[in-house]
């Protein structure tokens, strides 16, 4: 019995179906086919879970969180024992193993390994201003998404004809911050943060209203 090489890993957007491949060759009839799919979740590597089981001509559910979402892609028994996972969740990320036994065929490689990574687009980021909006001050524009896998990068732009940040601005696209030093009237305007990763983008907006000191009325 020989389980074929799997592609190293599969990436899928959260909520989309994933197919985890596993095929094998065997010299024996498929009368005593026994297939166990296991997962070692990334979130809990010490706690392997059963995903689905085929034994004695019957299918059995694995861990409760997979109930109703997992099945074999084809009619069993077969030499293609790939599975699908519907409505993928972040917690489905992990290393999946198919363990195949088909007595009396023994020997050879009976395990296939595939990694599954569930990707999440950036959630709508939260934009904030740190510091005083008085003219001459330094301000920090903050942007962060609560969700996003892979981790989003953040690009700030000023929403006007140029889309350029003021010349006194420095940007950190990893942290999602922009520091604008010595703000002036020309710093005022709408600033948009675009949070991006491999599968999506999301935006938020700030209205920077730089305030000049008001002349005092002298009684």
């Amino acid at each position: 019995l020989e389980v074929s090489e799997s592609p190293g890993s599969i990436q899928v957007a959260r909520g989309q179906p994933a197919v985890l491949p596993c095929t094998f060759t065997t010299s024996a009839a498929l009368i005593n086919l026994n297939v166990i799919w296991m997962v070692t979740p990334l979130s809990n590597a010490n706690q392997p879970e059963q995903v689905i089981l085929y034994q004695g001509g019957q299918m059995f559910d694995g861990a409760p969180r997979f109930h109703g979402r997992v099945g074999f892609t084809g009619t069993m028994p077969a030499t293609n024992v790939s599975i699908f996972i519907n409505n993928t969740q972040l917690s489905d990320t992990g290393t999946y193993q198919c363990l195949v036994n088909n007595l009396p065929d023994i020997g050879g490689r009976n395990i296939g390994v595939t990694g599954l990574t569930v990707l999440v687009p950036p959630s709508a980021p939260h934009c904030q201003i740190q510091g005083s909006q008085d003219i001459g001050s330094d301000v920090i524009l903050l942007c962060s998404s609560e969700e996003g896998i892979p981790r989003p990068t953040y690009l700030w732009e000023k929403l006007d004809n140029t889309l350029k940040l003021p010349p006194t601005a420095t940007q950190d696209q990893v942290q999602g911050t922009v520091t604008i030093r010595n703000i002036s009237a020309l710093s005022s305007g709408l600033y948009q943060c675009v949070a991006s990763n491999a599968i999506g983008t999301s935006t938020c907006l700030l209205d920077l209203q730089v305030i000049s000191p008001q002349p005092r009325n002298i009684g």
């Epitope: 959630s123 709508a124 980021p125 939260h126 934009c127 904030q128 201003i129 909006q133 000023k158 929403l159 006007d160 004809n161 009237a185 020309l186 005022s188 305007g189 709408l190 948009q192 999301s202 935006t203 938020c204 907006l205 700030l206 209205d207 920077l208 209203q209 730089v210 305030i211 000049s212 008001q214």
Partner: antibody, heavy 120, light 106 residues
Framework: EVKLVESGGGLVQPGGSLKLSCAAS????????MSWVRQTPEKRLEWVAY????????YYPDTVKGRFTISRDNAKNTLYLQMSSLKSEDTAMYYC?????????????WGQGTLVTVSA | QIVLSQSPAILSASPGEKVTMTCRAS?????IHWYQQKPGSSPKPWIY???NLASGVPARFSGSGSGTSYSLTISRVEAEDAATYYC????????TFASGTKLEIK
């Protein structure tokens, strides 16, 4: 008391131009971003232009970009909207709106509006 | 562009009832604003940044939500609440409004 009074609306032919004004009082005009928002006869609200408090930054939706120009005169406490190449779909009540304090853009005060009708 | 949908389009309630109207966005947005408009008047700011009541808005109003789903709730409706309520987003240009929920008092 914050007060915004729009003027300049009226009947104009398709392809024509019109300039709206908004006189502001009761607050420090130069400290606040301003916008124009319109409401169609079907009661749909549409944001049409934004200008920063200093006047150096403007922004528009694609539907009016290149046809409408927002400006302000902080010395006169007045906001303007120059509209050109007008289309029938520009027919609406036009409101001048002052943005709120803080950094969330939102329309904290609205004027009573001025009606623009584009028709042959 | 982000499309905002409000439901229901028309909401009928008796004084004292609790009512909730929803605003759904076609993509995730960071916050929503709500405006109230009565016939013949200009819109008034009602709730800003999802949950903050604008000045003068009664405490029976509240706002909540995140991502693509937001709501405005009135704990005990009064006759003066009859109006059309619009939600609006500033996350992405164009800064769109929904078509509104008209609240009628029986």
């Amino acid at each position: 008391e914050v007060k915004l009074v729009e003027s300049g609306g009226g009947l104009v032919q398709p392809g024509g131009s019109l300039k709206l004004s908004c006189a502001a009082s009761g607050f420090t005009f130069s400290s606040y971003s301003m916008s124009w928002v319109r409401q169609t006869p079907e009661k749909r609200l549409e944001w049409v232009a934004y200008i920063s408090n200093g006047g150096g930054s403007t922004y528009y939706p694609d539907t009016v970009k290149g046809r409408f120009t927002i400006s302000r005169d902080n010395a006169k406490n007045t906001l303007y909207l120059q509209m050109s190449s007008l289309k029938s779909e520009d027919t609406a009540m036009y409101y001048c709106a002052r943005h709120g304090d803080g950094y969330y853009p939102w329309f904290a005060y609205w004027g009573q509006g001025t009606l623009v009708t584009v028709s042959a | 562009q982000i499309v905002l949908s409000q439901s229901p389009a028309i909401l009928s309630a008796s004084p004292g009832e609790k009512v909730t109207m929803t605003c759904r966005a076609s993509s995730s947005v960071s916050y929503i604003h709500w405006y109230q408009q009565k016939p013949g008047s200009s819109p008034k700011p009602w709730i800003y940044a999802t949950s903050n009541l604008a000045s003068g808005v009664p405490a029976r109003f509240s706002g909540s939500g995140s991502g693509t789903s937001y709501s405005l709730t009135i704990s005990r409706v009064e006759a003066e609440d009859a109006a059309t309520y619009y939600c609006q987003q500033w996350s992405s240009n164009p800064f769109t409004f929904a078509s509104g929920t008209k609240l009628e008092i029986k």
